[in-house]
Amino acid sequence: YDFTNCDFEKIKAAYLSTISKDLITYMSGTKSTEFNNTVSCSNRPHCLTEIQSLTFNPTAGCASLAKEMFAMKTKAALAIWCPGYSETQINATQAMKKARKSKVTTNKCLEQVSQLQGLWRRFNRPLLKQQGSSDYKDDDDKHHHHHH
């Protein structure tokens, strides 16, 4: 799915009002020094692509995130604010239901959610203005940036 045409401000509002709090609840009791973020994103559509992948695609050691409250709210936000997103997810949802019945919090899942928090931070405030893409739907001014 191409996230370019999503309403980023509405998704950001949904994240800040509820999803962020659900992520914090999920991570409660975890030391803030425990995980280093290894997944990054460069602009808002890219961030949503990575967020979708980490939230809904089962990975080795963490197959159950899609059933968490934050995942369901993420799915709802994308369905509402990304045109045509729902249609692309029907098969994925059915596969998800077959994949896992119970919710299990593993260390791998905690690490994955820590990565998600980092991706959402960059979605909320992209550090760099990427040439050829717009971080903000109404943004056409130039952001000064450097790559090291």
Epitope: N36, N124, L127, H148
Partner: antibody, heavy 119, light 107 residues
Framework: EVQLVQSGAEVKKPGSSVKVSCKAS????????IEWVRQAPGQGLEWIGV????????NYNENFKGRATLTADKSTSTAYMELSSLRSEDTAVYYC????????????WGQGTTVTVSS | DIVMTQTPLSLSVTPGQPASISCKAS??????VTWYLQKPGQSPQLLIY???NHYTGVPDRFSGSGSGTDFTLKISRVEAEDVGVYYC?????????FGQGTKLEIK
């Protein structure tokens, strides 16, 4: 406990450079942006720039472009702000701050480093 | 650059009375506004993020509202510990910019 501890006060000559350090502890340094803000005596807050310690990406306020350089050392969890070609108007308290968990605010601030530029 | 203009620049309030600070942006900043308080001799501290969300430990007598270009910070009942300079900040566009600050004193 998250802490940002900055280097001590500096007195510099006009035209010279200053390098202020900001040592972070209590969290995964690479995961959060570090912002730099300054405050001239009796004045408000002015944003200098931001660095992503994870990959070194930076974004600068145009007012400081070419004079300010932000760097980060992951091995020591320390961020640095170097300001060159100092002038008297650069006399200020310089703060480092960490972005919050949502990426929409600065939740932890250093204690500030006073830089005095005087001949 | 987006200019954030605060009014009033200073206010003196009797303990227990309300206080209100306005912040106007020179162009729309959506909901990307944060409020900080800088107490005398201290570093700034976070109060409200994304217009109306309380930071951890901030008393609920503080509230934020607004969208687009007009924003307000309200203190329902001012207490002695609330003295200091209040700053609004936008993070919708680089460079990030702050208001000039509003100094709150106790009568």
């Amino acid at each position: 406990e998250v802490q940002l501890v900055q280097s001590g006060a500096e007195v510099k000559k006009p035209g010279s450079s200053v390098k202020v350090s900001c040592k972070a502890s209590g969290y995964a340094f690479s995961n959060y942006l570090i912002e730099w803000v300054r405050q001239a005596p009796g004045q408000g807050l002015e944003w200098i720039g931001v660095i992503d310690p994870g990959n070194g990406d930076t974004n600068y306020n145009e007012n400081f472009k070419g004079r300010a350089t932000l760097t980060a050392d992951k091995s020591t969890s320390t961020a640095y702000m170097e300001l060159s070609s100092l002038r008297s108007e650069d006399t200020a308290v310089y703060y480092c701050a960490r972005e919050d968990n949502t990426g929409t605010a600065f939740d932890y601030w250093g204690q500030g480093t006073t830089v005095t530029v005087s001949s | 650059d987006i200019v954030m203009t605060q009014t009033p620049l200073s206010l003196s309030v009797t303990p227990g009375q309300p206080a209100s600070i306005s912040c106007k942006a020179s162009q729309s900043v959506s909901s990307d506004v944060t409020w900080y308080l800088q107490k005398p001799g201290q570093s700034p501290q976070l109060l409200i993020y994304y217009v109306s969300n309380h930071y951890t430990g901030v008393p609920d007598r503080f509230s934020g509202s607004g969208s687009g270009t007009d924003f307000t910070l309200k203190i329902s009942r001012v207490e002695a510990e609330d003295v200091g300079v209040y700053y609004c900040q936008q993070h919708h566009r680089f460079p990030l910019t702050f208001g000039q600050g509003t100094k709150l004193e106790i009568k």
